[in-house]
């Protein structure tokens, strides 16, 4: 027997559209092989009407399509504008028509009930509002007004002027009788459901002289927009539901089995744990439109998404909605990069951020995801020389190694740095990636004094102790500024005595500042790297003061008087002002990201994403 399955019989009416789903075992071969829909002839052949390879018969031109859903093991044949000529025996199948991988389908198109004379047709989107107008004559002005719905063969009362409301319409229907001058009553139904579709009859009066008017209500379900995005990339759902729901709670949900739609995020503060750290719901405009950005796309993110508006912040019957079918392409152009980076308190991390290598000139950014409210991502640093004030001296964005990757270094880590960070550019918005920084138990590998005071005109030597694990790494000192960290000459002073159980491969590398000037004040980093790949760093703040006594300064670890978590700044330390974003394209859909970067840091808890792709602070 054939493994293909579908409906044996399909019954429809003229003018209707039909979607026929055929199911196949989703093996690798089946997913990629040709899918077809053919009509069986009297002599046993089967003439192709449409196939997945793009063929469409002239009989189906402009009214049919075939869509394959390989991840589900289904393909769907949509046929519109059915006529009785479409009645017949068909096959849906895989491969070649004459082979056995097919299923027989009988399609019967009947003439249909047709609309009664004088029927007004109302076509309205799901979740919206319809007003059915019902005229009547003067003799029925004082008589009962009513609206019936034809269910099968029987009219069922929906609402009447004596106060009756059918339970299926409770809370979303009203009957309005116009002023005495107008011989018209109207029935307003809002939060329209698919089940509201059908034929209605309005009536004024109950006897043989009653006035009647027929109405045909068609409720349109939104067709899902097909969205294809790369694994590890990003997707933005733009949701415009109209000004009438501007003040109603918004949501994005993902359809699971049956008719359940699990909330991914909503404006009431709910967020699915699987999206922690990688989702933003951007503030809505006055017209009620909003957008949702999801980064770090995973295979399991594929599926059908709905955005909508409802006071509960979740999908209910009658919610106005928009739909998308998200496909996640596993043959991604976005390279793998660690989704978790670990560092120790007082230590550092170096994060590699991928970007579209065709956009090497784009501005690079790094922001901190905050879960409060609907999620926001205040910028911390960019490649144009802006650094958020609280991060001066301990955060740098480097264009290296280049060719599709930039590096962000954050040192002087504290538990408050744990959290989710986004790498992004002002170019390709699909290349947004997420990394989680975790603060783990341990000691920093590099040892430097906590803070140092230099004397004007004298010489200052600052030590940095590198353990033997970094023997093969290049060791450097640099002076931090808001555009990066400029390399400085340093001296290798032989093995360090700062490490227990560490042999001759440990190193003490010193930074020497001759004839100190005011310009030497600032942050200095020592660090390790291999080629263009950066490892751990440690930061020292050098303050400069007036000469008190002659001589040079040689700072040792013992003289350090600041804990790794502290940053000792003199009162004259200059804070860089908040930088305005120049490029208006940046975050066109997420103003919150750009507008809120000058707000104070809040406390952040680390959330374990359960990722297996982890990276230590000093590894590549």
């Amino acid at each position: 027997k054939s493994p293909i399955f579908g409906p044996e019989e399909v019954n429809s009416v003229e003018g209707n559209s039909v979607s026929i789903t055929c199911y196949y075992p989703p093996t690798s071969v089946n997913r990629h092989t040709r899918k077809y829909w053919c009509r069986q002839g009297a002599r046993g052949g089967c003439i192709t009407l449409i196939s997945s390879e793009g063929y469409v018969s002239s009989k189906y031109a402009g009214r049919a399509n075939l869509t394959n859903f390989p991840e589900n093991g289904t393909f769907v044949v949509n046929i519109a504008q059915l006529s009785q000529d479409d009645s017949g025996r068909y096959k849906c199948g895989l491969g070649i028509n004459s082979r056995g991988l097919s299923f027989d389908v009988s399609l019967e198109v009947s003439q249909g009930p047709g609309l009664l004379n004088d029927t007004k047709v109302y076509t309205v989107d799901l979740g919206r509002t319809v007003t059915i107008n019902c005229p009547f004559k003067t003799e029925n002005a004082q008589k009962r007004k009513s609206l019936y719905k034809q269910i099968g063969l029987y009219p069922v009362l929906v609402i009447d002027s004596s106060g009756y409301v059918n339970p299926n319409y409770t809370g979303r229907i009203r009957l309005d009788i116009q002023g005495t001058g107008q011989l018209l009553f109207s029935v307003v139904i809002n939060q329209l459901r698919l089940s509201d579709a059908g034929q209605y009859l309005c009536q004024a009066g109950d006897d043989s002289n009653s006035n009647k008017k027929n109405a045909d209500l068609q409720v349109l379900k939104p067709e899902p927009e097909l969205v294809y995005e790369d694994l590890r990339g990003s997707v933005t759902f733009h949701c415009a539901l109209g000004p009438e729901v501007a003040n109603v709670a918004k949501f994005l949900c993902r359809q699971s089995s049956g008719e359940n739609c699990d909330v991914v995020v909503n404006t009431l503060g709910k967020r699915a744990p699987a999206f922690e750290g990688r989702i933003l719901l951007n503030p809505q405009d006055k017209d009620g439109s909003f957008s949702v950005v999801i980064t770090g796309l995973r295979k399991e993110d594929a599926g059908r998404y709905l955005c909508g508006a409802h006071s509960d912040g979740q999908l209910q019957e009658g919610s106005p909605i928009q739909a998308w079918q998200l496909f996640v392409n596993e043959e991604s152009t976005i390279p793998r990069s660690p989704t978790v980076v670990k560092g120790v308190a007082g230590g550092s991390v170096a994060v590699l951020c991928p970007y579209n290598r065709k956009e090497s000139k784009s501005i690079k950014y790094w922001c901190l995801w905050e879960g409060a409210q609907n999620g926001r991502c205040p910028l911390l640093v960019d490649s144009e020389g802006w650094v958020k004030a609280q991060y001066e001296g301990r955060l740098s964005l480097l264009e290296e190694p280049g060719n599709g990757t930039f590096t962000v270094i954050l040192n002087q880590l504290t538990s408050r740095d744990a959290g989710f960070y986004w790498c992004l550019t002002n170019g390709d918005t699909l290349w947004r990636t997420t990394v989680e920084i975790k603060i783990i138990e341990g000691e920093p590998n590099l040892k430097v004094p906590g803070n140092v005071t230099a004397v004007l005109g004298e010489t200052l030597k600052v030590p940095c102790h590198f353990p033997c694990k970094f023997s093969s790494y290049e060791k450097y000192w640099c002076k931090w500024n808001n555009t990066g960290c400029q390399a400085l000459p340093s001296q290798d002073e032989g093995p360090s005595k700062a490490f227990v159980n560490c042999d001759e491969n440990s190193r003490l590398v010193s930074l020497t500042l001759n004839l100190v000037t005011r310009a030497d004040e600032g942050w200095y980093w020592c660090g390790v790297k291999q080629g263009h790949f950066y490892g751990e760093t440690a930061a020292v703040y050098v303050a400069v003061e007036e000469r008190k006594a002659a001589g040079s300064r040689d700072v040792s670890l013992a003289k350090a008087d600041a804990a790794p978590d502290e940053k000792v700044l003199d009162s004259g330390f200059r804070e860089i002002e908040n930088k305005a974003i120049q490029d208006p394209r940046l975050f066109a859909e997420e103003k919150a990201v750009a507008d809120t970067r000058d707000q104070a840091d809040g406390s952040r808890a680390s959330v374990d994403s359960g990722s297996s792709e982890e990276q230590g602070g000093s590894s590549r």
């Epitope: 409906p7 044996e8 019989e9 399909v10 429809s12 209707n16 299926n168 049956g258």
Partner: nanobody, 126 residues
């Protein structure tokens, strides 16, 4: 709340016929699926047949091993579904469940159906 009530199950001789009936109440939507599954002692629940109404069209699905013997049909108001079973054999012995659901995609998957009846026992003796 949707409620499904099955009836018609009984003991029947091999080769005999039987009509099962399922009456639904509370189905307020126009698009849904309604059909039959069965579960023999010690076996998984398996798909038998389903009718699905969607956007003005009706779709009929049957399991391969009941084709030519079992027929599924419905009343005009779509709230009653019948399963006519002919040429019954002992392998058809099972509890037959009526199931209904909105947005049913994979009709053969029990998990796609939201509502279930209590079941009616069909015993086919040889």
């Amino acid at each position: 709340e949707v409620q499904l009530v099955e009836s018609g199950g009984r003991l029947v001789q091999a080769g005999g016929s039987l009509r099962l009936s399922c009456a639904a109440s509370g189905l307020t939507r126009s698009d849904y699926a309604m059909g039959w599954f069965r579960q023999a002692p010690g076996k998984e629940r398996e798909f038998v047949a389903t009718l699905k109404w969607s956007e003005g069209s009706r779709f009929m699905y049957r399991a391969e091993d009941v084709k030519g013997r079992f027929t599924i049909s419905s009343g005009a108001a779509k709230t009653t579904v019948w399963l006519d079973m002919d040429a019954l054999n002992p392998e058809d012995t099972a509890v037959y469940y009526c199931a209904a659901g909105f947005n049913v995609g994979f009709v053969r998957r029990a998990s796609e159906y939201n509502f279930w009846g209590q079941g009616t026992l069909v015993t086919v003796s040889s």
